[in-house]
Interface confidence: low
């Protein structure tokens, strides 16, 4: 009587992750009676992966009836493969038996999970960083195989060099992970500049996986101030102007003082946005000159999204005319009684 | 027998918290994942959480932050520790087991019944 | 998160019909798929598992089929305990969800 083999043809077998795998096993007699088993691994660890006497096993199915008492062909099909399902496979011959005994296996299938990267997540810094300073951006994509990748950094569609990638682990494994860091330099025309991560695999049939960030969630731009004074119509009174131009983000608190002194505080609101992405914004006082004092200094003190505070101090110019439209008797406060005292636009 | 049973149900404040136990016989609680599903009075079925034979968990979004499943093997016991409970959490709790190979629910507890109002 | 849809939400039937209820996946779930029964007041009950696996001590007059979105259970030949609510469930991936349940009532 010929001694019984079972033949497992392919050395090895390669598929994509979410796809089915066929595995051959065919066996040259199927005396003794007895079970076909299929494992993962060798050894007293491994994993059934198919019964064909019990069990539920809803993943793999018999490529043919093995019911049927002629058919020799055990071969199985896994639906549905994962990077996890990667391994080594084995057909076993068991005699029938309590316990049923292991008689012949076949020389094994390495299974390979060729398995799509998730989509690359990209995370900035925590904190603001102002123009010309440089900031880290992270790229991460999980889950791919084998392990082979290409990672590329873009800012505005220019590829980026000076970035630092990994993929782990280092050996081998059903998967694997990639990071990567890029260094940006920052301008001030960057608030409306994007970070790409691009990532290319087998696995994407040349249809790389892109991952976005903005540098407007990255960059603060410092306001610049200016303080300017005009005549109004009323020949007592001035206007007073801070320009607060080119900040970013939009959070912003100004302070008027006079002579040191808090005069009053405003939230910017009704901001014009300039073509980069920054903000302009102006607040003004009406000042009444009959009331003024000799040396009158008058602060806009500005507070950029929780920053310390920049200001620009402006010393009140009252002509002799408007001196001499005073009477000697005036007094009262440096800032004309309107309501409000100030105004923005 | 399999057999799986709840208790710690009851009546509780919004805002309150309460713990559910589950109790299980006849086989090892730990080499099965384990879930808790509920359902409000008059409404369906909701998968709430569950733990795996790792120790992972997973929860549904409404649960989030608020519920932690977990598990005392030495108990063969499940746990389902719910806080801030809110009257929308209001049901009957029950105890799943899921089957080895696919974590196919297969044994279910009788239920307990959690209400939660002011 | 993947949403099940049964239908019919109720349906009438007598004792001995064969009725028919559907169940579809808002997205692809191989054959992931299980029916429960459930009576007023009693847990629900496992009948099928993976789409057309009956459970242990499931009658087999308990049939399911499917495969991707759609799916069936089918109740060969009613009798007066068939009549409860019967629920689908998906459980490729968390979170697991269960179709709003299919009321079979006595005509």
């Known amino acids: 009587e010929e001694e019984l083999q079972v033949i497992q043809p392919e050395k090895s077998v390669s598929v994509t992750a979410g796809e089915s795998a066929t595995l051959n096993c065919t066996v040259t007699s199927l005396i003794p009676v007895g079970p076909i088993q299929w494992f993962r691994g060798a050894g007293p660890g491994r994993e059934l992966i198919y019964n064909l006497k019990e069990g539920h096993f809803p993943r793999v199915t018999t490529v043919l009836d093995p019911t049927k008492r002629n058919n020799m062909d055990f071969s199985i099909h896994i639906s549905n493969i994962t990077p996890a399902d990667a391994g080594t496979y084995y057909c076993v011959k068991f005699r029938k038996g309590s316990p049923d005994v292991e008689l012949k296996s076949g020389a094994g299938t390495e299974l390979s999970v060729r398995a799509k990267p998730s989509a690359p997540v990209v995370s900035g810094p925590t904190a603001r960083a102002t123009p010309e300073h440089t900031v880290s951006f992270t790229c991460e994509s999980h889950g791919f195989s084998p392990r082979d990748i290409t990672l590329k950094w873009f800012k505005n569609g220019n590829e980026l060099s000076d970035f630092q990638t990994n993929v782990d682990p280092a050996g081998k494994s059903v998967s694997y992970s990639i990071r990567s860091t890029a260094r940006v330099v920052l301008t001030r025309r960057d608030v409306h500049s994007q970070v790409i991560c691009e990532v290319a695999h087998v696995t994407l049939q040349g249809d790389p996986l892109r991952g976005t960030a903005n540098l407007s969630e990255a960059i603060r731009v410092p306001p610049t101030l200016e303080v300017f004074q005009r005549p109004m119509r009323a020949e007592n009174q001035v206007n007073v102007t801070c320009q607060v131009r080119k900040f970013y983000p939009q959070r912003l608190l100004l302070t008027w003082l006079e002579n040191g002194n808090v005069s009053q505080t405003e939230t910017a609101s009704t901001l014009t946005e300039n073509k980069d992405g920054t903000y302009n914004w102006r607040s003004w006082l009406l000042v009444n000159t009959c009331a003024h004092r000799d040396g009158v200094v008058l602060t806009c003190q500005v507070e950029h999204d929780g920053q310390p505070a920049v200001s620009k101090s402006h010393a009140l110019e009252v002509s002799a005319h408007q001196k001499e439209q005073c009477s000697d008797t005036t007094s009262g406060p440096v800032l004309a009684p309107t309501a409000p005292l100030g105004g923005s636009g | 027998e399999v057999q799986l049973v709840e208790s710690g149900g009851g009546l509780v404040q919004p805002g309150g918290s309460l713990r559910l136990s589950c109790a299980a016989s006849?086989?090892?609680?730990?080499?099965?994942?384990m879930h808790w599903v509920r359902q409000a009075p008059g409404k369906g079925l909701e998968w709430v959480s569950a733990?795996?034979?790792?120790?992972?968990?997973y929860y549904t979004g409404s649960v989030k932050g608020r519920f932690t499943i977990s598990r005392e093997n030495a108990k063969n016991s499940l746990y389902l520790q719910m806080n801030s409970l809110r009257a929308g959490d209001t049901a009957v709790y029950y105890c799943?087991?899921?089957?080895?190979?696919?974590?196919?629910?297969?044994?279910w507890g009788q239920g307990t019944m959690v209400t939660v109002s002011s | 998160d993947i949403q099940m849809t049964q239908s019919p939400s109720s349906l009438s039937a007598s004792v001995g019909d064969r009725v028919t209820i559907t169940c579809r996946a808002s997205?692809?779930?191989?054959?992931?798929l299980a029916w429960f029964q459930q009576k007023p007041g009693k847990a629900p009950k496992s009948l099928i598992y993976?789409?057309?696996s009956l459970h242990s001590g499931v009658p087999s007059k308990f049939s399911g089929s499917g495969s991707g979105t759609d799916f069936t259970l089918t109740i060969s030949s009613l009798q007066p305990e068939d009549f409860a609510t019967y629920y689908c469930?998906?459980?490729?991936?968390?979170?697991?969800?269960f179709g709003q349940g299919t009321k079979l009532e006595i005509k």
């Open positions: 799943v087991r899921g089957g080895v190979w696919d974590d196919a629910f297969d044994i």
């Open positions: 006849g086989f090892t609680l730990s080499s099965y994942d």
């Open positions: 733990i795996g034979t790792a120790g992972d968990t």
């Open positions: 997205q692809d779930i191989n054959n992931y």
């Open positions: 993976t789409a057309s």
């Open positions: 469930q998906q459980y490729v991936s968390y979170p697991y969800t």
